[in-house]
Interface confidence: low
Amino acid sequence: LQDPCSNCPAGTFCDNNRNQICSPCPPNSFSSAGGQRTCDICRQCKGVFRTRKECSSTSNAECDCTPGFHCLGAGCSMCEQDCKQGQELTKKGCKDCCFGTFNDQKRGICRPWTNCSLAGKPVLMNGTKARDVVCGPRPADLSPGASSVTPPAPAREPGHSPQ
């Protein structure tokens, strides 16, 4: 015998208290698939979270972060404070990058400047708290058409800085 609940579409639930008829999900709840015996509670985007997409009877709400914060975690499960370029977030708030390190984003940690001498290249432009060192070409690389600068190191995956 076919389960009568399998006929209940998304946006409804199979109500055992009403002889397994399909009832609409109550306010602030949803079912994204058919045949569900309960509806899931909608996510509330409160405080530092703000609504990116409203809940509907068939889909959960989606949150992002208020200005000055950025999302962390799957589905924006956390909001982390933004810092200025040249800073990183610590337990005591935003702190300037130490000498020899930089951060060119509003999130993430300060990273060491590129060591041009390890690659046998001269420093073309000094680093700052907000910008990596720019290495020049090797003396032997100064041939027509050769790239004259090395791009900065790739940004690390955004996340919590060491606390």
């Epitope: 306010p27 602030n28 909608c42 509330q44 985007c45 990116r52 409203e54 809940c55 509907s56």
Partner: antibody, heavy 114, light 110 residues
Framework: QSLEESGGRLVTPGTPLTLTCTVS????????MSWVRQAPGKGLEWIGY?????SLYYASWAKGRFTISRTSTTVDLKMTSLTTEDTATYFC???????????WGPGTLVTVSS | DIVMTQTPASVSEPVGGTVTINCQAS??????LAWYQQKPGQRPKRLIY???DLASGVPSRFSASGSGTEYALTISDLESADAATYYC????????????FGGGTEVVVK
């Protein structure tokens, strides 16, 4: 982020009329949208919703005579069989189950008179 | 449909005073309640959502509480700029109960 209603004008009873709410700064795929009206000197009266999936909800008194639809950047309210009782400022508003109506347009005036 | 009964219809208080507006729902509305302020010729402005959460940019002089069928908005330290009509609003609709506004309360600041 803003809403702007248009289409309000003086019409005679029985004339159909469509109002348009133009949205900017956000996507209609992410928010519920409502139409609300306010007769001169009276309170706010909810007409209906369109949710993020395009599902429609209407006040019981509005079913059959009012129809809400949307495009990518507009939400329309189609009104039929207008009577003098429908004379009001019509507002579109953004919001749904989470926050109430957090953003409103300035409104557009519909006057039904013979 | 849900019916929202708002009282009083009008209230007058001096600058610096306190006003409380009540809103009763015909059924339990589970705190899906917002409060709006509307001045003549203007669009409504949301003050409160979720029965008690203050909308961003709204002064803390505005506060609200309630659950089930009984809700209230309180304005303390009244300012002349608070003169307006205030509406309560039940805003959940998936249950089929519909959306409803209270009839409004006019606040006059003396």
């Amino acid at each position: 982020q803003s809403l702007e209603e248009s289409g309000g004008r003086l019409v005679t009873p029985g004339t159909p009329l469509t109002l348009t709410c133009t949205v900017s700064g956000f996507s209609l795929n992410d928010y519920w949208m409502s139409w609300v009206r306010q007769a001169p000197g009276k309170g706010l009266e909810w007409i209906g919703y369109i949710d993020v999936g395009g599902s429609l909800y209407y006040a019981s008194w509005a079913k059959g005579r009012f129809t809400i639809s949307r495009t990518s950047t507009t939400v329309d309210l189609k009104m039929t069989s207008l009577t003098t009782e429908d004379t009001a400022t019509y507002f579109c508003a953004r919001g749904g189950l989470t926050y109430g109506f957090d953003l409103w347009g300035p409104g557009t005036l519909v006057t039904v008179s013979s | 449909d849900i019916v929202m009964t708002q009282t009083p219809a009008s209230v007058s208080e001096p600058v610096g005073g306190t006003v409380t507006i009540n809103c009763q729902a015909s059924e339990d509305i589970s705190s899906y309640l917002a409060w709006y302020q509307q001045k003549p010729g203007q669009r409504p402005k949301r003050l409160i959502y979720g029965a008690s959460d203050l909308a961003s940019g709204v002064p803390s002089r505005f506060s609200a509480s309630g659950s089930g069928t009984e809700y209230a908005l309180t304005i303390s330290d009244l300012e002349s700029a608070d003169a307006a009509t205030y509406y309560c609003h039940y805003y959940a609709t998936i249950s089929g109960l519909g959306v409803a506004f209270g009839g409004g309360t006019e606040v006059v600041v003396k």
